[in-house]
């Protein structure tokens, strides 16, 4: 296993609809044809997997059908979008990138993106 640098933004604010997008960029040391991207959430010293996708260079990211994540790739950049976020989902979202094929296997883990989610205020009742 060889190390690889992964960069991601420090902070992202989710939209009022609970959608957050950020770019995960990795410094590929070779010409990988298969890449696996995993988003991890760290909160209260616990790390959980949010979603994962495998893709071929030049192809779309393959998330499972029930995933809350979508994404696209361009070169060594992955544009990730996480949907359905609520205030309780605020936390550090870490991008993990693995170059799966061809060998050698490379692994890179970003420093994390702090995603802030603010639940929208309910609309006040109207007399009109």
């Amino acid at each position: 296993c060889k190390a690889m640098h992964v960069a991601q933004p420090a902070v992202v604010l989710a939209s009022s609809r609970g959608i957050a997008s950020f770019v995960c960029e990795y410094a590929s040391p070779g010409k990988a044809t298969e890449v696996r991207v995993t988003v991890l959430r760290q909160a209260d010293s616990q790390v959980t997997e949010v979603c994962a996708a495998t893709y071929m260079m030049g192809n779309e990211l393959t998330f499972l059908d029930d995933s809350i994540c979508t994404g696209t790739s361009s070169g060594n950049q992955v544009n990730l979008t996480i949907q359905g976020l609520r205030a309780m989902d605020t936390g550090l979202y870490i991008c993990k990138v693995e170059l799966m094929y061809p060998p050698p296997y490379y692994l890179g883990i970003g420093n994390g993106t702090q995603i802030y989610v603010i639940d929208p205020e309910p609309c006040p009742d109207s007399d009109f």
Partner: nanobody, 113 residues
């Protein structure tokens, strides 16, 4: 158990065509990006073509663009590689791939007059 079984390889003359098939079983085929790789004697294995789960996105190695077409039938758990205008340099063992987990055993394609 997981199986990827390739078929359709053989001997063909330059300029000819072949269609390779890969029948998958033992895993959820529609959840995987699928691909074809090839390996010529004395060379590294290289990507030929890839196709997304739905079949909506495809990509090709530079040397086969415009000549090869990858497709899939999720109802039949099968991925195909239509190869046209074959050249001697296309001679190789062709492998089916469920990205990034499983490999087929390969099928030989020989382009020669």
């Amino acid at each position: 158990q997981v199986q990827l079984v390739e078929s359709g390889g053989g001997l063909v003359q330059p300029g000819g065509s072949l269609t390779l098939s890969c029948a998958a079983s033992g895993f959820t085929f529609s959840s995987y990006t699928m691909a074809w790789y090839r390996q010529a004697p004395g060379k590294e294995r290289e990507v030929v073509a890839g196709i997304s789960r739905s079949g909506g996105t495809t990509n090709y190695g530079d040397s086969v663009k415009g000549r090869f077409t990858i497709s899939r039938d999720n109802a039949k758990n099968t991925v195909y590689l239509q190869m046209n205008s074959l050249k001697p340099e296309d001679t190789a063992v062709y492998y089916c791939r469920a990205v990034s987990d499983y490999w087929g055993q390969g099928t030989q394609v020989t382009v020669s007059s």
